[in-house]
Interface confidence: low
């Protein structure tokens, strides 16, 4: 049987001779050279050689456990003369014994990490890891311990885990943002003689909202013309915040001051500026200077830093309103005037007044906008604003005249204002009533006396205050011996009545009745209208059957003896 144990061989042998491994030996070996030892398997004949007479095994090269920790070989012992095995072929192991020849190596050459500024001591930052190629099962060659070479007193590292934590209170990004920490990993449990490796950890403090906004100046002054429309930007203010990003965002608001209702502040998201804008129309003559208290605040506040004070700041903004030459202002938005239609030319109707609202109180002149008075019926005294007629009026042609008066600053003609004038023309009884239509009627030959043959209506262009009251009568020249009578109905109508029984159309075919219509106003106006009455043959129902058409065709020579 074979006589050996497991072979052990120290790695990294540096001697000048071959390294002795061990001896293969069979109990059949009598020492007379009759046996021959043969080696086969991992590295046989190359890494490992055997003395075939003695069975001594030697390693020819330096071995590295980290490259190959175990070699499996086979041993044979054969009789030289017969060539037959004297022992069964047997497998054996050469185990490479570890020495501490590898330093710990970090998984990254450089680590980057972030941690919020102002973090509590002991806040986790990052974990670094180093590995050692030596045998962890034997000795302390692969037992790694972490320590900090650079980065104190700001950071610490847990020796066993490689966890880096904050070590200093109130680390302030605004003071210092970047830290370079060097960590060492040492084997042999950190003891003397251990091998070591290092890594760099670049740590950045991230921002938290630990700084309030601050105005660089306590007072700002801006100017704006009084003519600035609402929405006009008049100035920009900017508070600075040492924080960054969301934590440096600023909202502006007006918190106090007599300009609170007159101005607005809007936040420019891109520049983080507060833009002061006009909110309501300004008036230099009413108020020349406004003061505002403007506040800049962080919209996102971290409650744990409130002890540092309010996260806002305020500044005073003084706004000076500049005078702008404004147009004149009329005493009314519109004027309503009245004038009788019988007014003579140059009759004064009324007056308008306008004043320059500016401090200078520039004098104004007045004029009529000719586009609104194309017929030049009215005129104005350019100095005092008196309106007067320049043509005769007629209410019946136009009841209302709508004109525009312009007031212009004498020193600055570009400054002008306009006002509407509504002029009502009052009625005067200057029109006579007239028939509402042309009246031509007929009477039957067999008509009875006092029969109504026509109702008369009248119209009058005038418009008396108490309404129309017309009276009707036969003209004096036709009143005596007339064949017809006029009956005034006292309701602005009248009837034509027959005055006799029967008419003879052969005797008189047509009658012309002159009727006087008067109104009841002052001065009384009247007119005479003529009604034509034709005598016709009628049936027993009173329906006209025939008349002398010649009466219409040849009106000459007709009798007026109505």
């Amino acid at each position: 049987s074979w006589m050996w144990n497991q072979f052990f061989l120290l790695e990294e042998y540096t001697g000048s001779d071959y390294q002795y491994v061990g001896k293969l030996h069979s109990d059949q070996d009598r020492g007379d050279g009759s046996l021959k030892y043969i080696l086969s398997g991992d590295g046989a004949g190359d890494l490992f050689i055997i003395n075939e007479n003695t069975g001594d095994i030697q390693a020819t090269k330096r071995l590295d456990r980290e490259e190959k920790p175990v070699y499996i070989l086979r041993a044979q012992a054969i009789n030289r003369r017969t060539g037959r095995p004297v022992e069964p072929e047997s497998e054996f192991i050469i185990k490479i014994h570890d020495i501490n020849d590898n330093e710990p190596i970090f998984t990254k050459e450089v680590y980057t990490a972030t941690v919020p500024e102002m973090s509590d001591v002991g806040t986790f930052v990052v974990q670094v890891t180093a590995t050692d190629a030596d045998d962890p099962t034997y000795g302390n060659s692969a037992k790694v311990v972490y320590s900090i070479l650079q980065g104190q007193p700001y950071f610490s590292v847990e020796s066993e885990t490689g966890i880096i934590k904050t070590a200093l209170l109130n680390m302030d990004r605004e003071n210092r943002e970047q830290y370079q920490v060097v960590i060492q990993a040492k084997d042999m449990g950190g003891q003397m003689g251990g091998l070591s490796g290092t890594t760099t950890v670049n740590i950045t403090l991230t921002d938290v909202n630990d700084n309030p906004p601050r105005f660089p100046q306590s007072t700002y002054q801006f100017k704006t013309p009084e003519s600035s429309p609402p929405g006009t930007p008049i100035g920009r203010i900017k508070a600075s915040d040492a924080d960054v990003g969301e934590n440096a965002e600023i909202e502006y608001s007006i918190t106090d001051g007599e300009g609170l209702d007159m101005f607005d502040v809007i936040t420019d998201q891109e520049t983080q500026e507060g833009i002061i804008t006009v909110k309501k129309l300004l008036d230099f003559e009413k108020k020349k200077v406004y003061t505002l208290k403007v506040e800049a605040s962080n919209p996102y506040v971290e409650p744990r830093f409130l002890y540092l004070g309010p996260f806002k700041d305020s500044a005073t903004v003084r706004i000076v309103v500049e005078d702008v030459d404004e147009p004149p202002v009329f005493s009314k938005l519109a004027y309503i005037l009245q004038i009788r239609e019988d007014a003579q030319i140059n009759t004064t109707i009324g007056s308008v007044t306008a004043q320059d609202p500016d401090a200078a109180r520039n004098p104004v002149k007045y004029s009529v906008d000719r586009h609104t008075d194309m017929d030049r019926i009215f005129n104005i005294d350019s100095g005092n604003g008196s309106i007067f007629t320049s043509k005769l009026l007629d209410r019946e042609t136009l009841l209302w005249h709508n004109i525009t008066v312009i007031a212009t600053e004498i020193n600055n003609p570009k400054q002008s204002s306009r006002v509407p004038l509504y002029i009502k023309v009052l009625d005067v009884n200057d029109n006579a009533p007239e028939f509402a239509e042309f009246y031509e009627t007929f009477v039957c030959e067999k008509a009875k006396a006092d029969q109504l043959i026509q109702t008369l209506h009248a119209v009058d262009k005038d418009d008396p205050y108490s309404g129309h009251q017309f009276s009707f009568s036969l003209a004096p020249e036709a009143a005596s011996g007339s064949n017809f009578t006029i009956q005034d109905n006292k309701d602005n109508t009248a009837g034509i009545l027959t005055r006799k029984n029967g008419y003879n159309r052969h005797e008189m075919s047509t009658y012309l009745l002159p009727v006087v219509i008067s109104d009841n106003d002052y001065p009384v106006q009247s007119s005479t209208g003529t009604v034509t009455v034709r005598v016709c043959a009628c049936d027993h129902h009173g329906n006209m059957q025939s008349c002398h058409a010649e009466a219409l065709i040849h009106p000459t020579g007709l009798s007026t003896g109505a």
Partner: antibody
Framework: QVQLQQPGAELVKPGASVKLSCKAS????????MHWVRQRPGQGLEWIGE????????NCNEQFKNKATLTVDKSSSTAYMQLSSLTSEDSAVFYC????????????WGAGTTVTVSS | DIQMTQSPASLAASVGETITITCQAS??????LAWYQQKQGKSPQLLIY???TLEDGVPSRFVGSGSGTQYSMKINSIQPEDTATYFC?????????FGGGTKLEIK
């Protein structure tokens, strides 16, 4: 939405007149002044005048006083501009436009009518 | 009439560049100024009013400024779609008047 519709083109002979239309929709027609603007080929913009659709009141650029007459038809929400005594100098694109916002700036425009004066 | 003098009449710029167009009024127009963009064959479009207020929907790269008689519009980081003619317009006094226009081309 607010729209101003104008015919695309008008071809007229020298000496004649043309009446351009601008039909408004999507807003109260009588509530906003209607403006007209001229643009000659390759040139800038010129303001012709404005009309108040409520009462027909107008403000006109003196330069166009004898050339353009502005009218409206409230029943059809349409504004008109009549151009008279046309010459080749009057060939241009004519836009109607309104100031729909709170300020005196033209924020809604018609597509424009191209007037070509040629015999 | 108030004269509006616009400059330059034309310019060419590369994508990403910033350009400035100016308008000078012949008298103080107190912020009553608008800027319009007109693309080839199209109606003008309002960009900025009240001298510096951006119309809804207009990109923030268009920036208006100025007061009194001097006004300008800056276009930051020019894009290909900014190829157009730009006009200023005063509505301070009748008749309303426009600048002569600035034609912007992209190189």
């Amino acid at each position: 939405q607010v729209q101003l519709q104008q015919p695309g083109a008008e071809l007229v002979k020298p000496g004649a007149s043309v009446k351009l239309s601008c039909k408004a929709s999507g807003y109260t027609f009588t509530g906003y002044w209607m403006h007209w603007v001229r643009q000659r080929p390759g040139q800038g913009l010129e303001w012709i005048g404005e009309i108040n659709p409520n009462n027909g009141g107008t403000n006109c650029n003196e330069q166009f006083k004898n050339k353009a007459t502005l009218t409206v038809d409230k029943s059809s929400s349409t504004a008109y501009m009549q151009l008279s005594s046309l010459t080749s100098e009057d060939s241009a694109v004519f836009y109607c436009t309104i100031s729909f916002g709170n300020y005196l700036f033209f924020d809604v425009w018609g597509a424009g009518t191209t007037v070509t004066v040629s015999s | 009439d108030i004269q509006m003098t616009q400059s330059p009449a034309s310019l060419a710029a590369s994508v990403g560049e910033t350009i400035t167009i100016t308008c000078q009024a012949s008298e103080n127009i107190y912020f009553s100024l608008a800027w319009y963009q007109q693309k080839q064959g199209k109606s003008p479009q309002l960009l900025i009013y009240n001298a510096n207020t951006l119309e809804d929907g207009v990109p923030s790269r268009f920036v208006g400024s100025g007061s009194g008689t001097q006004y300008s519009m800056k276009i930051n980081s020019i894009q290909p779609e900014d190829t157009a003619t730009y006009f200023c317009d005063q509505t301070y006094d009748f008749p309303w008047t426009f600048g002569g226009g600035t034609k912007l081309e992209i190189k």
